[in-house]
């Protein structure tokens, strides 16, 4: 799966993750930080 | 308009496996979680998980892992949900419900049945 | 988990009266963007819930002003100013703040 950085207007995006950019699928994807999960690490779980 | 559209009732024999449907129209189907509801005959709501269509991305309730196990096709813009080794508790109406990032519970199914008898 | 303990179970009352509902969490629900995701459904016999309130005191398009929500941190309050027949039911409060999400265990509506 080749990927890249996401553009600039994705920035606050990912609101707890990085986010980077499927290129064969051309969708944006978040990679959460540890403890969250969520399409957008918007979800903290305990 | 959004609307979330069932299967039909189910009976099925203790230890068996069934598997339920949820057909959603009126929105772009990755764009929304689909999320699972149990209610016992007169009890309350469980949320057993959510499923985001497209890249798929999964969380189950750990009360319901290894019991559940949700999946969609985006061809047909449908989730299904497994229920595996079914035991009487596993008896209830079992609810799909979308619900949009950091947004309600805006739109339901009507539910479907699962009756667990020998 | 976070744990909703709502209060009462049963509430019976007159049609015309004030109704309240009260749901506390045992934790914060509040999110890390500030909002804080408790949200209210309604479940009449043989329907689905339907959603009243959400993000404690937004009301859902169509949900008539006598329904309120009000509340922050872990205790939260459901009114009814005036009750109608058609309100009767069963109450849930949700949050979606963490996962696993969790619903309280409902308040049933009834006439006295």
């Known amino acids: 799966v080749s990927i890249t950085k996401c553009s600039s207007d994705m920035n606050g995006y990912c609101l707890h993750g990085q986010c980077i950019y499927l290129v064969d699928m051309s969708q944006n994807y978040c990679r959460c930080e540890v403890g969250y999960t969520g399409v957008r690490c918007e979800h903290f779980f305990l | 308009q959004v609307q979330l559209q069932q299967s039909g009732p189910e009976l099925v024999k203790p230890g068996a496996s069934v598997k339920i449907s949820c057909k959603a129209s009126?929105?772009?189907?990755?764009?929304?979680?689909i999320n699972w509801v149990k209610q016992r005959p007169g009890q309350g709501l469980e949320w057993i998980g959510w499923i985001w269509p497209g890249p798929v991305i999964t969380y189950y309730n750990p009360k319901f892992k290894g019991k559940a196990t949700l999946t969609v096709d985006k061809s047909s813009s449908t989730a299904y949900m497994l229920l595996s080794s079914l035991t009487s508790e596993d008896s209830a109406f079992y609810f799909c419900a979308r619900r949009e990032v950091l947004s309600p519970f805006a739109y339901w199914g009507q539910g479907t049945l699962v009756t667990v008898s020998a | 988990d976070v744990l909703m303990t709502q209060t009462p179970l049963s509430l019976p009352v007159s049609l015309g009266d004030q109704a309240s509902i009260s749901c506390r969490s045992s934790?914060?629900?509040?999110?890390?963007?500030?909002?804080?995701?408790l949200e209210w459904y309604l479940q009449k016999p043989g329907q689905s819930p339907k959603l009243l309130i959400y993000?404690?005191?937004n009301r859902f398009s169509g949900v008539p002003d006598r329904f309120s929500g009000s509340g922050s941190g872990t205790d939260f309050t459901l009114k009814i100013s005036r009750v109608e027949a058609e309100d009767l039911g069963v109450y849930y409060c949700f949050h979606g703040t963490h996962v696993p999400y969790t619903f309280g265990g409902g308040t049933k509506l009834e006439i006295k």
């Open positions: 934790q914060s629900i509040v999110h890390s963007t500030g909002n804080t995701y």
């Open positions: 993000k404690v005191s």
């Open positions: 009126g929105y772009t189907f990755t764009d929304a979680y």
